[in-house]
């Protein structure tokens, strides 16, 4: 992948749009199809005041931890769906798209050099544990996915891409 492909805002917007479409397809978060068990996901709420003051290395840690947990969550949802008696085709399609999207985004971030930010010297303070929450519907899962992309991921890539432009 070209090193700065993720710096083209249209790339991230495409994945955000896919996640929002998936959320809409699941017919609302109150009455939509439920997960047979609760799944742990990252808390996507961004404290903008705190985020702006974080070093880019700290932001990278939050983004990588979030991406990792989100990938696990969607794979878990895929497994739950596979074990259900009659999984809706559209739901399977959106789960597959989300898994593919997360893999692509992970690759694009690696190419951007974001993983280098994680190599902190041994004497640095360990990162605060990732805040998490649980979801019980596919709609909520897709909403978390969309919010993570348009929140922490977008803010982080924006900062890294801006630095690279200088």
């Amino acid at each position: 992948a070209p090193p700065r492909l993720i710096c083209d805002s249209r790339v991230l917007e495409r994945y955000i749009l896919e996640a929002k479409e998936a959320e809409n397809v699941t017919m609302g978060c109150a009455e939509g199809p439920r997960l047979s068990e609760n799944i742990t996901v990252p808390d996507t709420k961004v404290n903008f005041y705190a985020w702006k003051r974080m070093e880019v290395e700290e932001q990278a840690i939050e983004v990588w931890q979030g991406l990792s947990l989100l990938s696990e969550a969607i794979l878990q949802a895929q497994a739950l769906l596979a074990n259900s008696s009659q999984p809706p085709e559209t739901l399977q399609l959106h789960i597959d798209k989300a898994i593919s999207g997360l893999r692509s985004l992970t690759s694009l971030l690696r190419v951007l050099g974001a993983q280098k930010e994680l190599m902190s010297p041994p004497d640095t303070t360990p990162p605060a544990p990732l805040r998490t929450l649980t979801v019980d519907t596919f709609c909520k899962l897709f909403r978390v996915y969309a919010n993570f992309l348009r929140g922490k991921l977008k803010l982080y890539t924006g900062e890294v891409c801006r630095r690279g432009d200088r």
Epitope: K45, V46, F48, N147
Partner: antibody, heavy 116, light 109 residues
Framework: QVQLVQSGAEVKKPGASVKVSCKAS????????MSWVRQAPGQGLEWMGW????????NYAQKFQGRVTMTRDTSISTAYMELSRLRSEDTAVYYC?????????WGQGTLVTVSS | SYELTQPLSVSVALGQTARITCSGD??????VYWYQQKPGQAPVLVIY???KRPSGIPERFSGSNSGNTATLTISRAQAGDEADYYC???????????FGGGTKLTVLG
Amino acid sequence: QVQLVQSGAEVKKPGASVKVSCKASGYTFTSYYMSWVRQAPGQGLEWMGWINPLKGNTNYAQKFQGRVTMTRDTSISTAYMELSRLRSEDTAVYYCAREGMYFDIWGQGTLVTVSS
Amino acid sequence: SYELTQPLSVSVALGQTARITCSGDSIGDKYVYWYQQKPGQAPVLVIYDTNKRPSGIPERFSGSNSGNTATLTISRAQAGDEADYYCQSWDLDFNTYVFGGGTKLTVLG
């Protein structure tokens, strides 16, 4: 104590520019972002933009893009907000506000009157 | 761009509970801040991170947030609570802060 002291009231003609200053004291100026918020008479609060005093980078509300410029002078711990091409609707009290975990410290406000 | 909508005014009887709402698309997915402003004064924060109180703010002030509505609740309303109240959050699409239009709280009696 921690405080933000703003420059005095201004009267300007339409089309002119105004530059409001905000002097910080009692804390490390470069450790906190600074936002500017305005309030027209009898109206609500309107966020205009922020500046990072350490690096000088800024982000402006869409509404003010192209008309507002936020700068700082770290040597005197002062932030500035300049608004150009003034119109009568720009008549307002302009506040600087320090960003801690929220807008925790506010200046006393500067009344800018735009009148022909 | 992201918008926050508040009722223009809310009235409450002295000693009763006032609720001020702030509506915005999926605001439940964001942190919300509430500011109190009295005439001729700069705003003062009463709730941050949706439901936390800064030191010096009475326990009577609380906040909640779910779905498309955030709420500031003032229990046992006092005459001194009369003020304008503003909710605030941010627009992640532009990395900008957003204020609601403000609500004038009147304490009757």
